[in-house]
């Protein structure tokens, strides 16, 4: 699986989308988990409704919500009031029995600067972060990691 990067702004909401084959995963509940270390387990954060037919209902665990469009084949996770400690590697999963298939690997990055304080197309530098208590705009920027790019910070 390639890793997709979603960048959000601290204090705001970030929406992560995980597309999947709706026929292949028909009848399966979904989950969002956080990867603990490069080779560690994926710790469940939140999962869709226990009744698959009610997967469209948004379920919350703390500041994280999950909802599943089972017909369209899109799992959506919302991270509300994004904070620097939310940065890290996550997975969207499709559950069947005690097994879980990875739908998408996601690297969440937290930007310190609200994007709407800058012109579109300008450069962004983390050292130029501002205070932004009142911002409520949702932003989501995604990209795939470059070949060879490691989604974990160096341990040195």
């Amino acid at each position: 699986h390639n890793t997709t990067v979603f960048q959000g702004v601290a204090g705001q909401s970030l929406q992560v989308s995980c597309p999947y084959d709706s026929m292949k995963h028909w009848g399966r509940r979904k989950a969002w988990c956080r990867q603990l270390g490069e080779k560690g387990p994926c710790q469940r954060v939140v999962s869709t409704h226990n009744l698959w037919l009610l997967s469209f209902l948004r379920r919350w665990n703390g500041s994280t919500a999950i909802t599943d469009d089972t017909l369209g084949g899109t799992l959506t996770i919302t991270l509300r009031n994004l904070q620097p400690h939310d940065a890290g590697l996550y997975q969207c999963q499709s559950l069947h029995g005690s097994e879980a298939d990875t739908l998408r690997k996601v690297l969440v990055e937290v930007l310190a600067d609200p994007l709407d304080h800058r012109d579109a197309g300008d450069l962004w530098f983390p050292g130029e972060s501002e205070s932004f208590e009142d911002a409520h705009v949702e932003h989501s920027i995604s990209r795939s990691l470059l070949e060879g790019e490691i989604p974990f910070p160096p341990t040195s």
């Epitope: 940065a87 937290v110 579109a120 197309g121 300008d122 450069l123 962004w124 920027i141 790019e149 910070p153």
Partner: antibody
Framework: QIQLVQSGPELKKPGESLKISCKAS????????MQWVKQAPEKGLQYMGW????????TYADDFKERFVFSLETSATTAYLQINNLKNEDMATYFC?????????????WGQGTLVTVSS | DIVMTQSPSSLAVSAGETVTINCKSS????????????LAWYQQKPGQSPKVLIY???TRQFGVPDRFIGSGSGTDFTLTISSVQAEDLAIYYC?????????FGSGTKLEIK
Amino acid sequence: QIQLVQSGPELKKPGESLKISCKASGYTFTDYAMQWVKQAPEKGLQYMGWINTQTGKPTYADDFKERFVFSLETSATTAYLQINNLKNEDMATYFCVRSYNNYENWFAYWGQGTLVTVSS
Amino acid sequence: DIVMTQSPSSLAVSAGETVTINCKSSQSLLYSGNQKNYLAWYQQKPGQSPKVLIYWASTRQFGVPDRFIGSGSGTDFTLTISSVQAEDLAIYYCQQYYNSPITFGSGTKLEIK
């Protein structure tokens, strides 16, 4: 593939002006800022600033606020660096560069450089 | 502006040896939002444009030999070239992209004995 192709070498006299072009191809021009780097003979790399390719707004590093002008011809996916009232210290190779993206500003793509010679 | 202090300014080694180039920044380049160091290393061979070797302080650009290793965090960074080869003759620069304006180290000229 992504390419930045710059105009050829320039020989100018002090006090004259020049305009260097940088033709971008292989990507959506307006998605990425265009940046400029100066390298004087036997010297290191000096960042000059960037131009927002969506709005045309330039941002200059402190040493380049006076006689330097960044501009665009978006339809031709080309960025320009103009230097007015040339001085001897402007003698250098100038590179146009593009970051990996506007949030990760390591320079993934470089033009071949344009050598500017200033001599009376 | 963030000042990047690079050392040594030049060094001459024999093929097969290991080289260490240091880069120190005047402020931390580690961003808490993603735990990444906003530092890159470039190689500039004679008559050529610079080429990125390493970004995020330790991530090798695709196609760069694994002899090139970037390490460090915060303010102190190192580029290590193991088993130096003749084609490594070049000037090496560190660059911070944590803050504007972007700044470079003064360069390290690598010569092969």
